[in-house]
Interface confidence: low
């Protein structure tokens, strides 16, 4: 039959070459002369010329040594043709399998492997995996089967067998207890990979195991007792810096300190923060301390870490005795902001109120008073009694100084301490309206035609508050009523001015008296420009030579 079984050829053959491998034979050679040829990669296509065939005998020839790691299998086709070139057989598949020899050593994928494991872990904890490769065959032979081993460990503390490596996977694990970062922060392992499943060629590499920090050391106060002095009333004042030592890795959560005031801060006066660089505890005042109430505080501060302890550890406690120093304190107005109702326009010299301060200090200090801010200069304050008196006319309608009926004054109290201290208070005078403003019309200039004149509507305003405002009443005076009429509308907030007799083109004064609900009267002169025109006008038409 025109078939050939797969041919096995070992790699790295010594020859001599060409080397006969197998004979192709067609049974058609009984009838006619047959010529043999081969095609395919390794024959007539790259890599060309590795194989050849004796044309007339059909012997398959190997022309040079093979390398399994380069090409492990060749697939060729055998051809048989008669003398006239006609094909006598279908092309035949020829498989040439290159068999492996152990011609490669294992190779680690890295010269140095790096891994890490927490200190104090239990035996059996996986650390890292190393890998070596071998180009030889590991399926049909052991040539490429790698076995891993640890050759040496440095340092050999606490002993020389702290780690093990899985023979076939390369996984490095902890085999003994006693990993302590504070004693040995790093191990260097020399590892081996051997082919033939441990009986062949060997290569080495280094595995560096970093021992990671666990919070297995508590921070300790050094010293444990402190004395500090703080002036009373100081807020945000640094009282004391507390120092700790911690054997864990600097600047890690296992080293960074967390401080807690465990006792002694009954009034919630203190706070403690951690300095980001030094790790010190910075004790500061959250609120002012009061010498008169308590002149000494004893605080108990406990320190732990940002990270929880991995095992039960005793915590360190510091004692801080804080001595409060007496300070001359500022007088305090009672209340800090005082509202007083007072009628506007009260006579000069009239008392407005008494506004006094108390001194927190225990000594009987003398307090003197003065006005600190009185925008309109309306008030005076007795330096001894704190009595506030009107020295100017309080005017509710003064928009410059009065907002929403309130006139705001700031007063100052000063004690006779050494040095003297001052406190301020706010006096809010609610000014009660009196009927001190008459109604005023707007606008005060009008332009009107002397024929079919349009009624002029004037708005009435009164700076006072109700009931000292509308309804308003209007009256024309000084003979203005001969030519004009003035009527207040139903709502009582506008006045309608009408020209009732013909006037020649000119400018006239209309004397209008308006009075409010409280009969406060205000006389206003309206400047009326009369024009020669009909109906509505804004400016007189034509040349205008009026006054």
């Amino acid at each position: 039959d025109w078939v050939v079984a797969p041919i096995s050829v070992p790699e790295n053959g010594k020859g001599p070459f060409p080397q006969r491998l197998n004979q192709l034979k067609s049974n058609k050679d009984r009838d006619t002369k047959i010529f043999y040829s081969i095609t395919g990669p390794g024959a007539d296509s790259p890599p060309e010329g590795v194989f050849a065939v004796e044309k007339e005998t059909g012997w398959l020839l190997l022309n040079k040594p093979l390398d399994r790691e380069e090409i492990a299998k060749y697939e060729l086709f055998g051809h048989a043709v008669s003398e006239n070139g006609a094909s006598v057989e279908d092309p035949m598949n020829i498989s040439i399998i290159v068999t492996d020899q152990n011609d490669h050593k294992p190779k680690f994928t890295q010269d140095t492997f790096r891994g890490s494991v927490l200190e104090g872990v239990l035996p059996g904890t996986s650390v890292m995996q190393v890998t070596a490769t071998d180009e030889d065959d590991a399926i049909y032979t052991y040539n490429g089967v790698v076995a891993y081993s640890i050759h040496s460990q440095e340092p050999k503390d606490p002993h020389d067998l702290m780690f093990t490596i899985h023979r076939s996977t390369g996984t490095i694990s902890v085999i003994s207890s006693g990993l302590d970062r504070e004693k040995v922060p790093e191990y260097t392992l020399t590892i081996q990979a051997t082919d033939m499943d441990g009986d062949g060629s060997t290569t080495t590499a280094v595995a560096v195991v970093e021992i990671l920090d666990a919070n297995d050391n508590a921070p300790m106060f050094d010293p444990q007792k402190y004395e500090a002095h703080v002036p009373e009333n100081a807020v945000g004042h640094e009282v004391q810096r507390l120092t700790v030592t911690d054997l864990d890795a600097p600047n890690s959560p296992a080293w960074r300190a967390t401080y807690l005031i465990m006792g002694g801060d009954d009034g919630d006066h203190f706070t403690i923060t951690t300095h980001p660089e030094s790790n010190q505890g910075i004790l500061t005042t959250r609120k002012g301390l009061d010498f008169e109430a308590k002149n000494q505080h004893t605080l108990y501060v406990e320190v732990t870490n940002e990270a929880p302890f991995v095992l039960k550890l005793p915590t360190s406690t510091a004692t801080i005795v804080v001595h409060v120093e007496d300070v001359n304190e500022a007088p305090v107005f009672v209340p800090p902001s005082k509202v007083v109702e007072v009628q506007e326009g009260i006579p000069t010299g009239e008392p407005v109120c008494v506004y006094t301060a108390e001194d927190p200090d225990k000594e009987n200090q003398k307090i003197s008073y003065r006005i600190l801010r009185d925008p309109a200069g309306w008030l005076a304050m007795d330096p001894d009694s704190g009595q506030v008196t009107a020295v100017g006319t309080l005017d509710r309608e003064d928009e410059q100084f009065v907002r929403n009926n309130i006139y705001e004054v700031m007063v100052l109290a000063m004690d006779n301490g050494s040095p003297p201290t001052t406190g301020t208070g706010t006096l809010l005078l609610t000014l009660i309206d009196v009927n001190d403003h008459g109604p005023v019309p707007e606008p005060r200039q009008i332009t009107i035609c002397n024929q079919s004149p349009v009624r002029q509507v004037l708005n009435i305003t009164d700076k006072d508050l109700s009931p000292h405002t509308s309804p308003f009443q209007a009256q024309l005076t000084d003979d203005s009523d001969i030519y004009w009429t003035a009527e207040v509308n139903e709502e009582g907030d506008t006045v309608v001015l009408s020209l009732k007799k013909f006037l020649k083109q000119d400018t006239y004064d209309v004397h209008l008296s308006l009075s409010d609900h409280g009969n406060k009267e205000q006389l206003t002169v309206i400047r009326a420009t009369v024009c020669d025109c009909h109906g509505h006008v804004e400016t007189c038409p034509g040349p205008w030579k009026g006054g």
Partner: antibody, heavy 119, light 107 residues
């Protein structure tokens, strides 16, 4: 003597915020209102607003509402102004100024903080 | 808002001259007018408040006058140290507004 010490020059990117300070000394900080004024390059002065350090009450120029935020820290006698959503239009010198009593105008001024807004 | 107008943006004068800088308000500001001096280095000082009152420490050669909408600042005897930009400011109504400034230079 009365002094208003403003913070140093600022270079910031558009869209960012900036907070400048004005430290007062030589007088009772809470007794006087603190005003802020803007001066764009080669231009006149624009009033931003003021804060009463005693009460914390703030009055803004409508033009600067939402742009400027005024605060004070009484313990350090310092006034602050924060400007947000910055654009090149905000590049200017900003002054803090103390308001005198009664009709006294702005009787003492800081040296000014130069703000440059640029990408 | 009240507009403050300083019509003269720059002014040249000789040392010893009497110099007047004017300022106009868009409405009556009832004497609530202040004058400020800004030196070339940016330093700002109050000179005059409430139209004519001299701020403490300001030389008496500076004076102010005016009423209603028209105000002026006068330097009676110009000195080298007076080279600056002068701003008027109204304190009558919110928002407080400033004039455009008058830059004073030496001839």
């Amino acid at each position: 003597q009365v002094q208003l010490q403003e913070s140093g020059p600022e270079l910031v990117k558009p869209g960012a915020s900036v907070k400048m300070s004005c430290k007062a000394s030589g007088y009772s900080f809470t007794a006087y209102n603190m005003h802020w004024v803007k001066q764009s390059h080669g231009k006149s002065l624009e009033w931003i607003g003021f804060i009463d350090p005693y009460s914390g009450i703030i009055t803004y120029n409508q033009t600067f509402k939402g742009k400027a935020t005024l605060t004070v820290d009484k313990s350090s006698s310092t006034a602050y102004m924060q400007l947000n959503s910055l654009t090149s239009e905000d590049s200017a010198v900003y002054y803090c100024a103390r308001r005198g009593y009664y009709d006294g105008g702005f009787d003492y001024w800081g040296q000014g903080t130069t703000l440059t807004v640029s990408s | 808002d009240i507009q403050m107008t300083q019509t003269t943006s720059s002014l040249s004068a000789s040392l010893g001259d009497r110099v007047t800088i004017s300022c106009r308000a868009s409405q009556d500001i009832t004497n609530y007018l202040n004058w400020y001096q800004q030196k070339p280095d940016g330093t700002v000082k109050l000179l005059i408040y409430y139209t004519s009152r001299l701020h403490s420490g300001v030389p008496s050669r500076f004076s102010g006058s005016g009423s209603g909408t028209d105000y002026s600042l006068t330097i009676s005897n110009l000195e080298q140290e007076d080279i600056a930009t002068y701003f008027c400011q109204q304190d009558s109504k919110h928002p407080r507004t400033f004039g455009g400034g008058t830059k004073l230079e030496i001839k």
